[in-house]
C-alpha cells in the first residue's frame, strides 16, 4: 500500500459508504436476515471527549483490537452464511466486500504504524479490555462495521495522520 494512503479522507469514506450500503441492503435490523448464532463484535460507542484525551498509542491499540475482532466476526458470518440454504446473492456480495475492505484497511493501518503499538502497548497491564457486544442480525453486524469506521477508526487516523504531518 502507498505510504499514508489512509490519510486521504476519500479512501476511508469509500469503505464507510460500502459499509452503509451493506447495512441498507439487509432491510433494517428488526426484520432483516438473522445470524444463526450470535457473533461477538466491538462496541463502537464513543465518548468523544474521552477518546480525544486518549494517547494516540492507546487509540491505536483499541482500533487494532476492534479491527481484528470485526474481521473475525465477518469471517464467522461468512461461514454461517455459506452453511445456510439459499443464501441471498446480494448479502454474499456485501460480506465479501466487507472482508476485502477490512483486509485493505488492516494493510493501510500497518503502514501508518498502528500495529507497532499492539506489540508494545503503553501500560499494557492497565489497558482496559476491549468492550464488546453481540450481533444477531446481518444488519447489526454491518452497522457495527459502519460505526467502527465512522467513529474510532476515523478519529484515530485523523489524529495519527495529523501527527505524521508535524
Amino acid at each position: 500500500a502507498p505510504p499514508r494512503l489512509i490519510c486521504d479522507s476519500r479512501v476511508l469514506e469509500r469503505y464507510i459508504l460500502e459499509a452503509k450500503e451493506a447495512e441498507n441492503v439487509t432491510m433494517g435490523c428488526a426484520e432483516g436476515p438473522r445470524l444463526s448464532e450470535n457473533i461477538t463484535v466491538p462496541d463502537t460507542k464513543v465518548n468523544f471527549y474521552a477518546w480525544k484525551r486518549m494517547k494516540v498509542e492507546e487509540q491505536a491499540v483499541e482500533v487494532w483490537q476492534g479491527l481484528s475482532l470485526l474481521s473475525e466476526a465477518i469471517l464467522q458470518a461468512q461461514a454461517l452464511q455459506a452453511n445456510s440454504s439459499q443464501p441471498p446473492e446480494s448479502l454474499q456480495l456485501h460480506i465479501d466486500k466487507a472482508i476485502s475492505g477490512l483486509r485493505s484497511l488492516t494493510s493501510l493501518l500497518r503502514v501508518l504504524g498502528a500495529q507497532k503499538e499492539l506489540m508494545s502497548p503503553p501500560d499494557a497491564t492497565q489497558a482496559a479490555p476491549l468492550r464488546t457486544l453481540t450481533a444477531d442480525t446481518f444488519c447489526k453486524l454491518f452497522r457495527v462495521y459502519s460505526n467502527f469506521l465512522r467513529g474510532k477508526l476515523k478519529l484515530y487516523t485523523g489524529e495519527a495522520c495529523r501527527r505524521g504531518d508535524r
Epitope: K45, F48, Y49
Partner: antibody, heavy 117, light 108 residues
Framework: EVQLVQSGAEVKKPGESLKISCKGS????????IGWVRQMPGKGLEWMGW????????RYSPSFQGQVTISADKSISTAYLQWSSLKASDTAMYYC??????????WGQGTLVTVSS | SYVLTQPPSVSVAPGKTARITCSGD??????AYWYQQKPGQAPVLVIY???KRPSGIPERFSGSNSGNTATLTISRVEAGDEADYYC??????????FGGGTKLTVLG
C-alpha cells in the same frame, strides 16, 4: 471545588460587538475543555461549540459557525465567547461549562445578554 | 445535522416512576446524556454514558439507551424533581447535540 465564574449581564444595541468571559478555578484549566451553550428566553439548550485550551482546538456547532468566535487564554484560565455584530435574536442566557468524560459536568452561573435598540 | 426529539411534558404523581424519552436516528449507537434544569438555575448532569450517575446524583435516577430511544427513569419521584430535563449526545464528528427538553410536572 470546581468553579466557573462568568462575566456579568450585558445590554447592547444591534450591530455592537461583545466579548463575554468564563474563568475556571479549582481544577487544571488545560486538562479539560470548555463548552458554550445558549438558552433563549423560555427555550431549550443549544450547544454552540467547545474549545480545548491546551491544544487550542475549537469545534463550532454548524448553527453557530461564523456567528460567534470562541477563544481561551490559558495563562489566566479564561474562555471567551464573542460577537462582532450583535442581533436582537442573540438575546439569551449564555452558559459556559466544563467538558470532561462526564460532559458539561460543571456550569457557570450564566451571562444574560440583551440586545435591543 | 443530528436531531434529538423529546416529549414537551411528562406528569407523574409523587412516589411513582417517571420515564422521559429521547429519540434520534440510531441513538443507541451513541452515548446518551441527561441534564436537569430547575427554573433560574444552570443545568446539572444527572446521567452520562447512557446509564452512569455522577457523584451526588441519587440512585433514583437511571438511564438506558438502545435502538432509537434513550430513556431517563426517575423512581420514587419527589416534588424536588420537578424541572426541565434535556437529553444530549456526542456525534462521531465531535458535535454535542441537545434534545428540545421535557418539562416534568409532579402532580399534587
Amino acid at each position: 471545588e470546581v468553579q466557573l465564574v462568568q462575566s456579568g449581564a450585558e445590554v447592547k444595541k444591534p450591530g455592537e460587538s461583545l466579548k463575554i468571559s468564563c474563568k475556571g478555578s479549582g481544577y487544571s484549566f488545560t486538562s479539560y475543555w470548555i463548552g458554550w451553550v445558549r438558552q433563549m428566553p423560555g427555550k431549550g439548550l443549544e450547544w454552540m461549540g467547545w474549545i480545548d485550551p491546551y491544544r487550542s482546538e475549537i469545534r463550532y456547532s454548524p448553527s453557530f459557525q461564523g456567528q460567534v468566535t470562541i477563544s481561551a487564554d490559558k495563562s489566566i484560565s479564561t474562555a471567551y465567547l464573542q460577537w462582532s455584530s450583535l442581533k436582537a435574536s442573540d438575546t439569551a442566557m449564555y452558559y459556559c461549562a466544563r467538558v470532561s468524560s462526564e460532559p458539561f459536568d460543571s456550569w457557570g452561573q450564566g451571562t444574560l445578554v440583551t440586545v435591543s435598540s | 445535522s443530528y436531531v434529538l426529539t423529546q416529549p414537551p411534558s411528562v406528569s407523574v404523581a409523587p412516589g411513582k416512576t417517571a420515564r422521559i424519552t429521547c429519540s434520534g436516528d440510531k441513538l443507541g449507537d451513541h452515548y446518551a446524556y441527561w441534564y436537569q434544569q430547575k427554573p433560574g438555575q444552570a443545568p446539572v448532569l444527572v446521567i452520562y454514558d447512557d446509564s452512569k450517575r455522577p457523584s451526588g446524583i441519587p440512585e433514583r435516577f437511571s438511564g438506558s439507551n438502545s435502538g432509537n430511544t434513550a430513556t431517563l427513569t426517575i423512581s420514587r419521584v419527589e416534588a424536588g424533581d420537578e424541572a426541565d430535563y434535556y437529553c444530549a449526545t456526542w456525534t462521531f464528528e465531535g458535535d454535542y447535540v441537545f434534545g428540545g427538553g421535557t418539562k416534568l410536572t409532579v402532580l399534587g
